[in-house]
Amino acid sequence: FNISGCSTKKLLWTYSTRSEEEFVLFCDLPEPQKSHFCHRNRLSPKQVPEHLPFMGSNDLSDVQWYQQPSNGDPLEDIRKSYPHIIQDKCTLHFLTPGVNNSGSYICRPKMIKSPYDVACCVKMILEVKPQTNASCEYSASHKQDLLLGSTGSISCPSLSCQSDAQSPAVTWYKNGKLLSVERSNRIVVDEVYDYHQGTYVCDYTQSDTVSSWTVRAVVQVRTIVGDTKLKPDILDPVEDTLEVELGKPLTISCKARFGFERVFNPVIKWYIKDSDLEWEVSVPEAKSIKSTLKDEIIERNIILEKVTQRDLRRKFVCFVQNSIGNTTQSVQLKEKRG
């Protein structure tokens, strides 16, 4: 299709080489089509647009994204060619940063139902640059945490080094929806609830003598509880002896509960004590079996192909540790009688 009639928007993504970060493009269809199509309207539910020249479907995923190759080749369907780019409804998610993401991205409705719809498209020219060392050293992170029940704030990473006074007007989105009341480089939250968690996008306009473009940053916000003050506790094994049959295979499971920590480096491992010798056992990887806001339960198994006489004199020790401290639980195998 002819993209010359598409509205054009220029965006800049300056990414930090020190951290993982994501980026999004919204299918900013011209008003009022956008409101009908992607449900990102600025209108209140009682206000109805006077005319809807674009009669697209209400299905939120009925948008098609393309990339325009720089060499003039035909448009490429994003879904087929770019595994690190994911389409979610009217949003395009870039999972990994890199200058190779620079280029022109076009979105338009899948269903063309009227002659007006042909021109219903947006071309976004995205420029991606790594942050230079000259940039602000202490810029806000692209992953920010809000402590539940307390006050907090969400800072726009690309503007966090500027004072509120010199900051340009900022447009904020949360999970793709416009936050119309927020215009500064920082969103202040009086009391943090779990619904404050989500993907926030901050946009501001930067201009030079030639052109203007939108500088965009994406912030993943987590609502968290305070760091635990407790070392992990072992939920299983509970008993310090276990009845077994010689010659049979055996799996002993160690399940431990770790309280929430912002910087979470849980350790769960098995080691064997034989007399006063001890060594760590190479066992299958640990797996998380339950995760809540407050804690996480992690499991790791030790597998014996067959229980030998030697195993009966050994102690099998599960060791768990977080930043507060460690806990151990040892199991002695006992031969089943009869």
């Epitope: 007399s275 006063d276 010798l277 001890e278 060594w279 190479s282 006489q309 030697r310």
Partner: antibody, heavy 120, light 108 residues
Framework: SLEESGGDLVKPEGSLTLTCTAS?????????MCWVRQAPGKGLEWIAC????????AYYATWAKGRFTISKASSTTVTLHMTSLTAADTATYFC??????????????WGPGTLVTVSS | AIKMTQTPSSVSAAVGGTVTINCRAS??????LAWYQQKPGQPPKLLIY???DLASGVPSRFKGSGSGTEYTLTISGVQCDDAATYYC??????????FGGGTEVVVQ
């Protein structure tokens, strides 16, 4: 591999320190480093072992306590200090790694031995 | 201290025959028992560990058995290369350790 050194001709009542150097591995808590000796034409005699981990617990044959001292000099060397030597201590002294490897399999390694002769 | 008593001190066997060596500990050593083979001029070689487990690379004609205080090494289908001196050892170092006096195996 293990290599013993320090074997020598020593006078009765003299002292001597033997050194065992490990190459290809460093000490860990899954095994012991031991000393065993064998007098010419005789059987094997266990002297002492030291836990190769941080505990450094040392165990001695009853007859060796007081005269012989086993210690870890570094993460790859263990020594045996012997005092009040007599002709009966004349033997080839072997350094032995005994215990388990990192996978819990038994691991037993002997050095070639070093000869200690006690004579006036 | 643990004392290990090994019998016999010498045994001769024909090629293809069977040799049995016994070892008695002065107290329960919880199967912390090793058997070694030693040939003249060489350090000993581990044959059996934990009373009954065959060490890596050791032929299956060597078999260890026993528990508590009584242990046995059996060599079935004796070969010329089996001529050597065999030692049992308590390797329960934390409880004290000791070698047996040795058994010389002569193959005819």
């Amino acid at each position: 591999s293990l290599e013993e050194s320090g074997g020598d001709l020593v006078k009765p009542e003299g002292s001597l320190t033997l050194t065992c150097t490990a190459s290809g591995f460093s000490f860990s808590s899954s095994y012991y480093m031991c000393w065993v000796r064998q007098a010419p034409g005789k059987g094997l005699e266990w002297i002492a072992c030291i836990h190769a981990g941080s505990s450094g617990a040392a165990y001695y044959a009853t007859w060796a306590k007081g005269r012989f001292t086993i210690s870890k000099a570094s993460s790859t060397t263990v020594t045996l200090h012997m005092t009040s030597l007599t002709a009966a201590d004349t033997a080839t002294y072997f350094c032995v790694r005994d215990g388990y490897d990192d996978y819990g399999d038994p691991f037993n390694l002997w050095g070639p031995g070093t000869l200690v002769t006690v004579s006036s | 201290a643990i004392k290990m008593t090994q019998t016999p001190s010498s045994v001769s066997a024909a090629v293809g025959g069977t040799v049995t060596i016994n070892c008695r500990a002065s107290e329960d050593i919880k199967s912390y028992l090793a058997w070694y083979q030693q040939k003249p001029g060489q350090p000993p070689k581990l044959l059996i560990y934990d009373a009954s487990d065959l060490a890596s690379g050791v032929p299956s004609r060597f078999k260890g058995s026993g528990s508590g205080t009584e242990y046995t090494l059996t060599i079935s289908g004796v070969q010329c290369d089996d001529a050597a001196t065999y030692y049992c050892q308590s390797v329960w170092y934390a409880g004290g350790a000791a070698f047996g006096g040795g058994t010389e195996v002569v193959v005819q």
